[in-house]
Structure formats: C-alpha cells, structure tokens
C-alpha cells in the first residue's frame, strides 16, 4: 500500500545564467528510500543511491551539483533548460513515487523564484 506523497517546488522560474535548486520531499510514509533519480524529460541527470551516494550523468557534470539533501542544483542555466524535471523515489516496501517540477528559464532579470525548501 503506497501511502506516501511527494511534495515538490512545483512550477518555478529562474534567470538565464543563474542557478536553481530542485527539491522534492517524500512524506506520509515510513518507507525506506533506496534511491532517488533526477530526470529532465527522458534524460537522466543524477542518481542518489542510499548505499553508493551521488552519481551525476557525465553530460551534466559541469552544470549539475548534488544536494542540498536529496535535491539537485542546476547551474549556468540556459533557456534550453526550460521544461519538466522529475524526481523518482525508489522506496521499500512502497515502491516508486514520482514528483514533477516545471522550470522556466527567463532571459529577463525579473524572474521570480518559486518556493524552496530543504529536506530535513
């Protein structure tokens, strides 16, 4: 029985050239998180494995930093970074939970950042 829910930063915007923190938080379950995958559309950005720690995909190594917590920091943003991002929580015994974040990267300097929070 999957009782958990994923809270995300939702729809967020950021300035071109800047950075943004993508955060998801799994709540309302005692399930053990075995791994969190971060994906952009169908591209794997990073993995945080409970045993092995972080792995950043080679093609994103220069612009993606692990954390804070199970979140992901995107740096040197470009307009091409606009799109959907997914946090995929593999848990035991519940199974797989998926959260969605939409990021819009703006040319303007008046980009408003969405709410952010850190995993305790």
């Amino acid at each position: 029985m999957m009782t958990g829910t994923i809270e995300t930063t939702g729809n967020i915007s950021a300035e071109k050239g800047g950075s943004i923190i993508l955060q998801c938080h799994l709540s309302s379950t005692t399930a053990q998180v075995t791994q969190v995958n971060w994906e952009q559309q169908d591209q794997l950005l990073a993995i945080c494995n409970a045993d092995l720690g972080w792995h950043i995909s080679p093609s994103f190594k220069d612009r993606v930093a692990p954390g804070p917590g199970l979140g992901l920091t995107l740096q040197s943003l470009t307009v091409n970074d606009t799109g959907e991002y997914f946090c995929i929580y593999h848990t035991y015994p519940d199974g797989t939970y998926t959260g969605r974040i939409f990021l819009e990267v703006l040319e303007s300097s008046v980009a408003e950042h969405g709410a952010r929070f850190q995993i305790p």
Epitope: M2, T34, N49, A50, D51, D94, T96
Partner: antibody
C-alpha cells in the same frame, strides 16, 4: 563482457536448506543492486530477493521472508542466496540478475541453477 | 500485490508480420513496466524498460507503449530469431511481479 554464473542448486527435502552462489565478472560488482529471480516449473517468473550495492539493504517478498537470506561478498564479486525451511513451491530455476543503475529493470541475467524440493 | 495479466498466452505468426502482446496491471503502475525476452533454453533478456525505452542493442522493430494499467509490446517485421517467450514485469511497487508470459511461434 558481463557474466553471471550461478551454482549450488540441487535436490533437497522439504524443510531442508541450500545455499546458491552467483559469480559476477565484467563489471564493477559493488556498484550494482542485484536480485534473485526464480522461474517456476510452469515457466512463470517470480522475484525472490534483492540486495543493494553495498549490501546494507535487503528486500524480500512475503513468500520467502524469514526463510531466504540474500547476501554478497563484494571482495569476491559473489552474490548468495541462503534458503532454509524449503517448501515444494520453492522448486524453480533460480537466476541472479543485475539491476540497471537507474533501478528501473534487470539488464543482465545468469543462466540459472535448478532447485528441486521433494521428498 | 499487483497482478500482471498478459495476453495472449501463446501466439503464432508469419515472418514479416507485426504482432502485439498486451499486459494489464491490476492497478496503476504509471510507466514502470519492463518487457523481457526469453529464447528457448536461454536466460531472460531485457528488451524494454519504463514502458517504452528500448534497451541497448535491442533492434528497433521492438517497441513498447502504454501507461497506467494498459501496456503493449509490438514486434514489427517478425524475424526467425524472435521465437521466444515474452514477459512483462511491473516495477511500481513491491513485490515486483511478472506476467504469465506469451509464447511466440512462427507459422
């Protein structure tokens, strides 16, 4: 080349024990989650146990919980399945399998070792 | 447990045909559905993961689709080497469960 070679299967009486081994080569064994999956005489596949790369976390279906223990020796590149209190319904071909790093699916399987539980 | 119902259980087709195998989950599994091929006397081989993603080295005549509870595996331009049993597996929740398999034969 990724290779997974199982051994240790055989004929055992109900209530008996058996320990299966899976020798891995061709990849960094400690970086991969591994599983045992069995195939019944009716050819249906059943997940039997999973262990994380470092060996710190193990997962089982209710049907084998408390009777089967999955473990690994990363220094020897070997995966194990200790089976006890065996039942006739445990009769199957047992495969060891490697999970994709994304943890979405099992990408390599061994050839399997046969376990028959019968009096 | 999530039940995976696969159909048909067996299928006979001719070389060059396009065939479709379906897998139905007893509850929503999003896109967490994998397809495996097992040739006679051989070990299972991953074909498709995450419902539609072709595993490395798998010919493009294989394709997968679906989400939620309904999924299909399609093999176009059937080849002799496609003779095998095909099984689906859900990765949405523990215990991971498999379909009963579809045995594909060539006419």
């Amino acid at each position: 080349e990724v290779m997974l070679v199982e051994s240790g299967g055989g004929l055992v009486k109900p209530g008996g024990s058996l320990k299966l081994s899976c020798a891995a080569s061709g990849f960094t064994f400690s970086s991969y989650t591994m599983s045992w999956v069995r195939q019944t005489p009716e050819k249906r596949l059943e997940w039997a146990a999973t262990i994380s790369g470092g060996g710190g976390n193990t997962y089982y279906p209710d049907s084998v919980k408390g009777r089967f223990t999955i473990s690994r020796d990363n220094a020897k590149n070997t995966l194990y399945l200790q089976m006890s209190s065996l039942r006739s319904e445990d009769t199957a071909l047992y495969y060891c399998a490697r999970w994709l790093p994304t943890y979405y699916a099992m990408d390599y399987w061994g050839q399997g070792t046969s376990v028959t539980v019968s009096s | 447990d999530i039940q995976m119902n696969q159909s048909p259980s067996s299928l006979s087709a001719s070389l060059g045909d396009t065939i479709t195998i379906t897998c139905h989950a007893s509850q929503n599994i999003n896109v967490w559905l994998n397809w495996y091929q097992q040739k006679p006397g051989n070990t299972p081989k991953l074909l498709i993961y995450k419902a539609s993603k072709l595993h490395t080295g798998v010919p493009s005549r294989f394709s997968g689709s679906g989400s939620g509870t309904g999924f299909t595996l399609t093999i176009s331009s059937l080849q002799p080497e496609d003779i095998a049993t095909y099984s689906c597996q859900q990765g949405q929740s523990y215990p991971y469960t498999f379909g009963g398999g579809t045995k594909l034969e060539i006419n």
